[in-house]
């Protein structure tokens, strides 16, 4: 029987700065029940605190509410391991909420085949970002990633859109079905999931001279 | 312990490569950014570029977008930086070093640097 | 970019007596400055990150002051163990640049 090895927090995600949650991995048991403790201070404070919620986020987390989210600060926190035989600290984690956004995908993932009579036919692709991300304060910036492939393919065709809502592509098979994701990334922060696939058929007369 | 150890000294000549490693052990490696520094014979410090080892999304200074590429192995949590077409002013020590937490650009672990040598 | 000035290059300065020194960035940069050590043959340190908070295990004879444009970093009582180079670094806007160093030197 030892005191337990040295946990390490090792992850934090906030879907829109206004909560988030930090994950730990205990480290070593020790062959004894060990009770795990998450400990933090703002940058310029030395009062501690305990983690307000273990419950939301799931084994080993702490999650913290809008009450206990503030911008622009830095947190350092620390999770302590204590079992009958001691007690060991992972290293401080500095965590800035900014930095650690993971929206959600994009929404409204529109496709369709356009076919000008004056210009070469294009695939028209549109979506709107995910309701939690607010956009009209300008706290946030989000940039966006196409992927799309021939329903067969193995490999993802994958376009950087920028800031843009709505994208245009030439080059495409005619006669396949092709599937199409978008996903999205504040300019700090973590890609969002891929939206749904969204399918689209491409007209055999599909002709890109 | 948190440790970026990389590769050994190298000598190179004009117009070649060079791919510096950094293998990164003592935390979980796809937790924080990595960015590359170099630094002249007697000179200050130059940012090259920075990867999030977690997706492998990059950010380079301009300066180095054309001739340096940042990959990572995340299998071997290793981080490597590879800088082509390379000329006797890119004779330098150059450093991996990971961000200090997950929020902005300031560098609590370094390396040990890796001297390379630009010479015909 | 922002151009990070510092100043002066050298600082000559006796042990026990107080260092201060300065950087200047060329744009407005906040608070987003970090200060690091760096000896000879050894790979720069991390002293201070966000203008004024000392990292973890740094002595707290290590301060800085400022915001904005002009900051100063100020080492109390200087130990032997001190005298080195020491640079500023901006993380405000891309490409994150460093100052060009003072040295401080046993006078």
């Known amino acids: 029987q030892l005191p337990p090895g040295k946990p390490e927090i090792f992850k934090c995600r906030s879907p829109n700065k206004e909560t988030f949650t930090c994950w730990w991995r205990p480290g070593t048991d020790g062959g004894l029940p060990t009770n795990y403790s998450l400990t933090y201070h703002r940058e310029g404070e030395t009062l501690m605190h305990e983690c307000p919620d273990y419950i939301t986020g799931g084994p080993n987390s702490c999650h913290f509410g809008k009450q206990y989210t503030s911008m622009w600060r830095t947190y350092i926190m620390m999770v302590n391991a204590t079992n009958q035989m001691g007690s060991s600290f992972s290293d401080e984690l500095y965590v800035d909420v900014t930095y650690i956004v993971q929206p959600d995908p994009p929404l409204e993932l529109a496709v369709e085949v356009k076919q000008p009579e004056d210009r070469k036919p294009y695939l028209w692709i549109k979506w709107s970002p995910p309701t939690l991300i607010d956009l009209k304060t300008g706290w946030f910036t989000l940039l966006y990633e196409i992927r799309l492939k021939p329903e067969k393919a193995a490999e993802w065709e994958i376009h950087f859109a920028g800031q843009q809502t709505e994208f245009k592509i030439l080059s495409l098979h005619p006669g396949q079905k092709y599937l199409v994701q978008v996903r999205c990334k504040p300019d700090h922060g973590y890609w969002s999931a891929w939206s749904p696939a969204t399918f689209i058929q491409i007209p055999s007369d599909f002709t890109m001279n | 312990e948190v440790q970026l150890v990389q590769s050994g000294a190298e000598v190179k000549k004009p117009g070649s490569s060079v791919k510096v490693s950094c293998k990164a052990s003592g935390y979980t490696f796809t937790t924080y950014w990595m960015h590359w520094v170099r630094q002249a014979p007697g000179q200050g410090l130059e940012w090259i570029g920075e990867?999030?080892?977690?997706?492998?999304?990059?950010n380079y200074n301009q300066k180095f977008k054309d001739r340096a590429t940042l990959t990572v192995d995340k299998s071997t949590s290793t981080a490597y930086m590879e800088l082509s077409s390379l000329r006797s002013e890119d004779t330098a020590v150059y450093y991996c070093?990971?961000?200090?937490?997950?929020?902005?650009?300031?560098?609590?672990?370094w390396g040990q640097g890796t001297l390379v040598t630009v010479s015909s | 970019e922002i151009v990070m000035t510092q100043s002066p290059a050298t600082l000559s300065v006796s042990p026990g007596e107080r260092a201060t020194l300065s950087c200047k960035a060329s744009q407005y940069v906040g608070t987003a400055v970090a200060w690091y050590q760096q000896k000879p043959g050894q790979s720069p340190r991390l002293l201070i990150y966000s203008a004024s908070n000392r990292y973890t295990g740094v002595p707290a004879r290590f301060s800085d002051s400022g915001s904005g444009t002009e900051f100063t970093l100020t080492i109390s009582s200087l130990q032997s163990e001190d005298f080195a180079v020491y640079f500023c670094?901006?993380?405000?806007?891309?490409?994150?640049?460093f100052g060009g160093g003072t040295k401080v030197e046993i006078k």
């Open positions: 670094q901006q993380y405000s806007s891309y490409p994150w640049t």
């Open positions: 990867i999030d080892p977690s997706d492998s999304y990059s």
């Open positions: 070093a990971r961000n200090g937490g997950l929020g902005p650009a300031w560098f609590s672990y």
